[in-house]
């Protein structure tokens, strides 16, 4: 079957926006008026994945760009990049693992898991214009709430 | 608690459009799919189409595009479904359910259906 | 399109029998398979969604389960308000398909 998606932003829980920052990496800031422009459409792709009540399994892509979000070790730490793929073959169903998130969606507040290294989650620094980046805590000073905002196909 | 208030009953010539509508009240409107599924008299179920509020996505069956348009009001948290060029054939119970964005949890709450009826 | 073959068609049974109803999908459905209970002149209820969990205030006697692209939905111990027709569902691909229901009947 085709895979679904849905385009949508995603602001951290202190309203940052995510936006590109040089081809490769997300940085999230406070954005207002016109300037909300910058701020990246991801593509949510839901996706197969293990089974679980309140995790769903999602992939994201930057909208009308082949590129994912993706988890690899690196320097053996699970670290988040933005990987290129052929948009022949993305999205698809079977995404593979290091695409993968698991979406924890609770009172309109959304996480995402890595699917590849359980218990680390997408991140934001407190500070202003840092990287966005996989973190291994919940619940300290890193941000790892996020807001989704619709967006039109 | 959610609840889906679909409008009444409608009698239409052959020919004329229809437009149903479906309020709902209890849940964030703009984060459901809003499905629409019909009802022949003593026939089984048939998905016509659903609508994403809080985007604007629509996707149709084939099998009724020309034949229903799905629209939606954010201000007032309502649905529409409007089917047009009427015939006998389109004489069922019409029903609005939801689903959430994601998929996940299934076409859970639904209207209590409108019967529409296409007579001469 | 997918299919979705539904069985029996009707099926008569006794309260505290158990039974069960099959959904047999065309294709692989990646488990977007849910089951509605329909009363004469009334709205479907949602019982199951993806495949087998359970929706909130649906009774335990109702399961669901899956075997490739075979669903199967089981009511332990019928009770009196348990006869109606019962429908599956698959919303994984468009255009969603429901299978034909199963008529429930007091033997």
């Known amino acids: 079957a085709p895979v679904r998606s849905l385009n949508c932003t995603l602001r951290d829980s202190q309203q940052k926006s995510l936006v590109m920052s040089g081809p490769y990496e997300l940085k999230a800031l406070h954005l207002q008026g016109q300037d909300m422009e910058q701020q990246v459409v991801f593509s949510m792709s839901f996706v197969q994945g293990e089974e679980s009540n309140d995790k769903i399994p999602v992939a994201l892509g930057l909208k009308e760009k082949n590129l994912y979000l993706s988890c690899v070790l690196k320097d053996d730490k699970p670290t988040l990049q933005l990987e290129s793929v052929d948009p022949k073959n993305y999205p698809k169903k079977k995404m593979e693992k290091r695409f993968v998130f698991n979406k924890i969606e609770i009172n309109n507040k959304l996480e995402f898991e890595s699917a590849q290294f359980p218990n680390w989650y997408i991140s934001t620094s407190q500070a202003e214009n840092m990287p966005v980046f996989l973190g291994g805590t919940k619940g300290g000073q890193d941000i790892t709430d996020f807001t989704m905002q619709f967006v039109s196909s | 608690q959610v609840q889906l208030v679909q409008s009444g009953a409608e009698v239409k010539k052959p020919g004329a459009s229809v437009k149903v509508s479906c309020k709902v009240s209890g849940y964030t409107f703009s984060r459901y799919w809003i499905e629409w599924v019909r009802q022949a008299p003593g026939k089984g179920l048939e998905w016509i189409g659903e609508i994403l509020p809080g985007n604007g996505n629509i996707n149709y069956n084939e099998k009724f595009k020309g034949k229903a348009t799905i629209t939606a009001d954010t201000s007032t948290d309502t649905a529409y479904m409007e089917l047009s060029s009427l015939r006998s054939e389109d004489t069922a119970v019409y029903y609005c359910?939801?689903?959430?964005?994601?998929?996940?949890?299934?076409?859970?709450?639904w209207g209590q259906g409108t019967l529409v009826t296409v007579s001469s | 399109d997918i299919q979705m073959t539904q069985s029996p068609s009707s099926l008569s049974a006794s309260v505290g029998d158990r039974v069960t109803i099959t959904c047999k999908a065309s294709?692989?459905?990646?488990?977007?398979l849910s089951w509605f209970q329909q009363k004469p002149g009334k709205a479907p209820k949602s019982l199951i969604y993806?495949?087998?969990r359970l929706v909130d205030g649906v009774p335990s006697r109702f399961s669901g389960s899956a075997s490739g692209t075979d669903y199967t939905l089981t009511i332990s111990s019928l009770q009196p308000e348990d006869f109606a027709t019962y429908y599956c569902?698959?919303?994984?691909?468009?255009?969603?398909?429901f299978g034909q229901g199963t008529k429930l009947e007091i033997k």
């Open positions: 993806r495949v087998k």
């Open positions: 569902l698959q919303y994984d691909e468009f255009p969603y398909t």
């Open positions: 359910s939801t689903i959430y964005y994601d998929y996940d949890q299934g076409f859970t709450y």
């Open positions: 294709q692989d459905i990646d488990r977007y």
